[in-house]
């Protein structure tokens, strides 16, 4: 026999049927010109030592065969001795180790197969009614074809899947979904209505993530309040990756899973924006004012469900940074400037009352004084801090107050609002002998002392109401009762306590009358 | 090799119709083509139909032609002939055969490696 035809003999080697499941597959067989046809397959296993014929009965019975010796494609044209224009039905045996492999079987045409092309390019995936839709170009000239998918997850076989007869310019698929696990697919394609026409070859591998991305598994932790006011979140636990099927692992487009981080800032409420969206690599810089983050998974079909925590207020207090000075026409506070042109954000509290209750103000921007000092001024009409109570002041600032990340915290105190002089005035003075020529005073703690770096001292007055002789006294913020020695007996005494802070005098208490008895001896 | 078990003949009366099977056991069904020979009493045995191992491919005696249907089913591992329009001259020992690779005819007994036992198919006038 020549090369160039189809053998009617019997095949040159031994009927010997392996049975193994390795060998030749994917045997694709069309016309590649006017006169000429091709047949290609793919073999699986060891290749050393393998012969390949192409084997072929014609519709009258007979049978040939061409030796491919170790290629695993063939050409021959329409002389060849197979018959193209009926059905005939090919096969590829393969002689190896003294055993003959059968691949599967093509019955087909000849001269009406056309070589088909798996789906090229962009295959496009969304999602519609809780199923899987795949659109993609019908590659050039071969409108009309059957389709067929294949998917795996990572830890199933390949399952086989029918997309149905396709008939225009685009073509598309519905293919199951899964809701946890993401998949691989591939495409091929045969001519429509030609019975026993070749597949094409798989498609490139096409990922597709799971319907839910996977929920964040991630900590996070918060560093200390830096000088600048600032503190860095951290990412103790970076999100667990998605387990890809094989032919997705590496380059897997399609199915990543994008981590965003939802900042939420918690204090401050009057300033222009609440929240920002960063990417989770890009972990920022917070002020010490409360937060909420969320981590949001997402992926082509949108987002997943989220983890939110909670980042509270940073509660460290500075001495003395703030100076306020309470005047006839109001009440202004005066703190170090950060720099030019700050905005400033200031958040005042009642002690001791939910965090919702907070108020704020926004500054408008504002250089530094010539003593380098910000400032903030309030009319006593306004209402602000104009209870007589602890308040909680944040003093936040931004060169750029419109960009969340960028706040930092200036500092954090207390303040006693209202008329602070009368109203940290101490009340229930008393006077108790204690020795001969000394007396022990008492009185309540100063409404100023629920403010933690309020009260800045007690002071005892002692005036001797014959001489007009006045002695003061200063008493630590933490005491409530003094002894003043040095007394005469049978002098008439007043005793007065008043509670001073920082920046303001308090106002006296009710003068207390007292005299030491003089002792008779007997 | 396969075994193959033949079952379904019997005496019928001309015009009718039979339907024979045959299981096979042993090695993988769907790797063998699969045929029907028949032996009538002094006759050589002949070639009366067969089919490829996908199941398309069909191939009949000039005699059974249009009459006779092969078909497969590979998850059932049996091989079928649907006999209709039965003539006297269709009796004989009908023989289910299995080659796992074809020689240069279809319809070349040589080829056909393992036979069943046959089912005796007798058409009376």
């Known amino acids: 026999c020549r090369t160039s035809e189809c053998c009617f003999q019997d095949p040159p080697y031994p009927d010997a049927d392996s049975g193994s499941a390795s060998g030749p597959r994917d045997l694709r067989c069309y016309r590649i010109s006017s006169d000429r046809y091709e047949c290609s397959w793919q073999y699986e296993g060891p290749t050393a030592g393998v012969s390949h014929f192409l084997r072929c009965c014609l519709s009258s019975g007979r049978c040939c065969y061409f030796a491919a010796g170790s290629a695993t494609r063939l050409q021959f044209s329409d002389q060849a001795g197979v018959s193209v224009l009926y059905t005939v039905t090919l096969w590829v045996e393969s002689w190896a180790r003294n055993q003959t492999e059968k691949s599967p079987e093509v019955t087909l045409q000849l001269y009406n197969s056309v070589k088909y092309e798996p789906p090229l390019g962009d295959i496009k995936v969304s999602k519609l009614a809780g199923q899987l839709r795949m659109e993609w170009e019908t590659p050039d000239n071969q409108v009309g074809a059957e389709v067929q998918f294949r998917h795996r997850t990572p830890s199933s076989p390949w399952k086989l899947g029918d997309c149905g007869p396709q008939d225009d310019d685009t073509e598309s698929c519905l293919c199951p979904l899964e809701m946890n696990v993401a998949q691989e697919f591939q495409l091929r394609r045969r001519q429509l209505g030609s019975q026993g026409s070749s597949w094409s070859k798989w498609s490139s591998p096409v990922c597709v993530p799971p319907e839910n991305p996977p929920q964040p598994q991630v900590r996070f932790s918060v560093e200390q309040l830096g000088q600048d006011g600032r503190r860095r979140l951290t990412l103790k636990e970076q999100p667990t990756q998605l387990e890809l099927p094989e032919g997705c692992q590496g380059l897997a487009p399609g199915t990543e899973v994008t981590y965003r981080l939802q900042l939420h800032m918690l204090s401050c409420p009057c300033k222009a924006k609440a929240t920002r969206t960063l990417h989770l690599g890009k972990m920022p810089y917070l002020s010490g004012a409360a937060y909420n983050v969320a981590v949001i998974s997402s992926n082509q079909f949108g987002p997943g469900l989220n983890q939110t925590w909670h980042i509270p207020a940073d509660t460290h207090t500075e001495p003395v940074a703030l100076n306020i000075s309470v005047g006839t026409n109001g009440t202004t506070m005066y703190w170090p400037a950060r720099a030019q042109s700050m905005t400033y954000c200031i958040e005042w509290q009642p002690v001791g009352q939910d965090g919702g209750l907070a108020t704020c103000s926004l500054t408008a921007p504002q250089d530094p004084d010539p003593a380098g000092m910000a400032t903030y001024s309030w009319s006593r009409e306004s209402g602000a801090m104009g209870q007589e109570k602890c308040y909680y002041i944040t003093i936040f600032a931004s060169a750029h107050p419109e960009k969340l990340t960028l706040w930092s915290t200036v500092l954090s105190t207390y303040h006693f609002g209202g008329n602070a002089s009368a109203a940290g005035t101490p009340h229930h003075v008393s006077v108790k002998n204690h020795s001969l020529d000394s007396v022990s005073v008492d009185w309540a703690p100063s409404l100023l002392s629920t403010c933690p770096g309020v009260l800045k001292e007690y002071v005892v007055r002692c005036r001797d109401e014959d001489s007009k002789q006045v002695s003061e006294h200063p008493v630590q913020p933490t005491e409530t009762q003094v002894t003043l020695s040095g007394l005469r007996a049978g002098v008439a005494y007043t005793v007065q306590v008043r509670a001073d802070t920082a920046w303001l005098r308090g106002v006296w208490s009710q003068p207390q009358r007292f005299s030491i008895e003089v002792q008779v001896s007997d | 090799q396969v075994q193959l078990v033949e079952s379904g003949g019997g005496l019928v009366q001309a015009g009718g119709s039979l339907r024979l099977s045959c299981a096979a056991s042993g090695r993988t069904f769907s790797s063998y083509v699969m045929g029907w020979f028949r032996q009538a009493p002094g006759q050589e045995r002949e070639f009366v139909a067969a089919i490829m191992r996908n199941g398309i491919m069909t191939y009949y005696a000039d005699s059974v032609k249009g009459r006779f249907t092969i078909s497969r089913d590979n998850a059932k591992n049996t091989v079928y002939l649907q006999m209709n329009t039965l003539k006297p001259d269709d009796t004989a020992v009908y023989y289910c055969?299995?080659?796992?690779?074809?020689?240069?005819?279809?319809?070349?007994?040589?080829?056909?490696?393992?036979w069943g036992q046959g089912t005796q198919v007798t058409v009376e006038p």
């Open positions: 055969a299995a080659a796992s690779r074809v020689g240069v005819s279809i319809s070349q007994s040589s080829s056909y490696t393992s």
